[in-house]
Interface confidence: low
């Protein structure tokens, strides 16, 4: 009579983790008697999973009836696959004795578990920094397997190319994590802007996952300053206006001096949004000429988000009559702030 | 089977330095092999690993400032611009696979002195 | 990245007494984790790999244990000659990582 073979047809089982796994396995002789034993990994150090004769295995269950007489198919199915249940399985035919001693092995059947990537994180530069500069953002996802992933970066729906990213482990596991770095250059347009990373793997259905960051938390606009002296708006009174325009964020504080002594000091509240999500903002200053003897230098200094202070200064000349003063560009009213400080 | 270092020697801040880990036994065509530093008194830091491919990767504190690279029976570690901080016992160890796991042939280690 | 934080700094154990060293991982990092003795003067050697298997030649007075984030290194029957420092290093992934090692922790033998 042809000797018993033990076959385990799948080569390989897919399954996603929370499903269950069926391991097949059918032997071509009932000789010699006895029992059947599942086994994850070869070797001295495998872990038995299923023991036809004793044992308590809560998670796996027999497909067919194992225990009738006749019986050949000895598969078996496994709940609540997770990742670590990840491997090799061997179905094993014992030959009755005390003890039972191994008889034949089928070829096994290697199971890998399919296990979704965790949503993407994206985290940017913990310091602001301004257009031009170059910037990295970084991306996280967890606990996937298969080892295969595919990330992407994109600005705005374009894609980028500047970035590395390393799967770890190197080795096997049973899952996986992905880590990216992309750098991404600014522009003052850029408050706006959203960076996305996209992770695609085989359990997403061709739905990838996303993340994304605002680029509104990264960049900082520096302003840019305009001195200009205003038509007379009574006898002896000179309108000087600082305009501060495309800076973001909004936190900004500009001091006036004359002749390099603080007049006052404010901070800017009352701001016009730009379309490109940068602020405008403009603060008036009232100076009583007759209270000068000689030319005045005012002087709007602004002090950005916390950065080293910017200025502009303007010359107001107290000799010349005040109505034939200055330049008379039209200002911009809102957000004005109009103190007399005389 | 076994690793050595050597070249460790008193340095002047800024000179380059290149130490060699010269391997018998094995192949590096087999075996990812690492880099780690200890400073005086104090505990293991890892620097880099070269692959079997060749392919290097660097403790995030150590890139720029370290290069590895092999040939068909040495390991490199280059300090590109010594301070007085990477004074330090610098070890080769072998990996136990190709892969990243663990540490298992060791070097006795090369003092690196950085004074000026 | 993964940060591997050791704990107690400094240990000491009488012969014959138990010496427990933990190690914690910032991230589940599984099995992969090592331990390594050094004494002074020498250089590391191997003790445990994927946190529980013990390395070709040591003792079986040195267990290792935990999986996930949580990890111990137990010495039971010390002798004079366990007197070192141990680490505890993460196998799972190098990329971004500051370092594999945990921070030591010195067992001194009375």
């Known amino acids: 009579e042809e000797e018993l073979q033990v076959i385990q047809p799948d080569k390989s089982v897919s399954v996603a983790a929370g499903e269950s796994a069926i391991l097949h396995c059918t032997v071509t002789s009932l000789i010699p008697v006895g029992p059947i034993q599942w086994f994850r990994g070869a070797g001295p150090a495998r872990e038995l999973i299923y023991n036809q004769k004793e044992g308590h295995f809560p998670r796996v269950t027999t497909v067919s009836e194992s225990t009738k007489r006749e019986n050949m198919d000895f598969s078996i199915s496994i709940s609540n696959i997770t990742p670590a249940d990840a491997g090799t399985y061997y179905c094993v035919k014992f030959r009755k004795g005390s003890p039972d001693t191994e008889f034949k092995s089928g070829a096994g059947t290697e199971l890998s578990v399919r296990a979704k990537p965790s949503a993407p994180v994206v985290s940017g530069p913990a310091a602001r920094a301004t257009p031009q500069h170059t910037v990295s953002f970084t991306c996280e996802s967890h606990g996937f397997s298969p080892r295969d992933i595919t990330l992407k970066w994109f600005k705005n729906g374009n894609e980028l190319s500047d970035f590395q990213t390393n799967v770890d482990p190197v080795g096997e596991s049973v899952s996986y994590s992905i880590h990216s770095t992309a750098k991404v250059v600014l522009t003052r347009e850029d408050v706006h802007s959203q960076v996305i990373c996209e992770v695609a793997h085989v359990t997403l259905q061709g739905d990838p996952l996303r993340g994304t960051a605002n680029l509104s938390e990264t960049i900082r606009v520096p302003p840019t300053l305009e001195v200009t002296q205003q038509p007379v708006r009574a006898e002896n009174q000179v309108n000087v206006t600082c305009q501060v325009r495309k800076f973001y964020p909004q936190r900004l504080q500009l001091t006036w001096l004359e002749n390099g002594n603080v007049s006052r000091t404010e901070t800017a509240s009352t701001v016009t949004e730009n379309k490109d999500g940068t602020y405008n903002w403009m603060s008036w200053l009232l100076v009583n000429v007759s209270a000068h003897r000689d030319d005045v230098k005012l002087t709007c200094q602004v002090e950005h988000d916390g950065q080293p202070a910017v200025s502009k200064s303007h010359d107001l000349k107290v000799s010349a009559h005040p109505k034939e003063q200055g330049s008379n560009t039209a200002a911009e009213n809102t957000g004005s702030n109009e103190r007399n400080i005389y | 089977q076994s690793v050595e270092e050597s070249g460790g020697r008193l340095v002047t801040p800024g000179t380059p330095l290149t130490l060699t880990c010269t391997v018998s036994?094995?192949?590096?065509?087999?075996?990812?092999m690492h880099w780690v530093r200890q400073a005086p008194g104090k505990g293991l830091e890892w620097i880099g690993i070269i692959y079997t491919g060749g392919a290097t990767s660097y403790a995030t504190w150590a890139k720029g400032q370290f290069t590895i690279s092999k040939t068909s029976t040495t390991v490199d570690l280059k300090i590109t611009s010594p301070t007085t901080e990477d004074t330090a016992t610098y070890f080769c160890?072998?990996?136990?696979?190709?892969?990243?796991?663990?540490?298992?042939?060791w070097g006795p280690g090369t003092l690196v002195t950085v004074s000026l | 990245q993964i940060v591997m934080t050791q704990t107690p700094f400094s240990v000491s154990a009488v012969v014959g007494g138990t010496v427990t060293i933990k190690c914690q991982a910032s991230?589940?990092?599984?099995?992969?984790l090592a331990w390594y003795q050094q004494k002074p003067g020498q250089r590391p050697k191997l003790l445990i790999y994927?946190?529980?298997t013990l390395a070709s030649g040591v003792s079986s007075r040195f267990k290792g244990s935990g999986s996930g984030t949580e990890f111990t290194l137990t010495i039971s029957g010390v002798e004079s000659a366990d007197a070192a420092t141990y680490y505890c290093?993460?196998?799972?992934?190098?990329?971004?990582?500051?370092?594999?090692f945990g921070g030591g922790t010195e067992v001194v033998v009375k």
């Open positions: 991230h589940n990092i599984g099995s992969w």
């Open positions: 036994g094995f192949s590096l065509s087999n075996y990812a």
């Open positions: 160890a072998r990996g136990d696979r190709d892969g990243y796991a663990y540490f298992n042939i």
């Open positions: 994927d946190a529980s």
């Open positions: 290093q993460q196998g799972y992934g190098i990329s971004y990582v500051h370092n594999v």
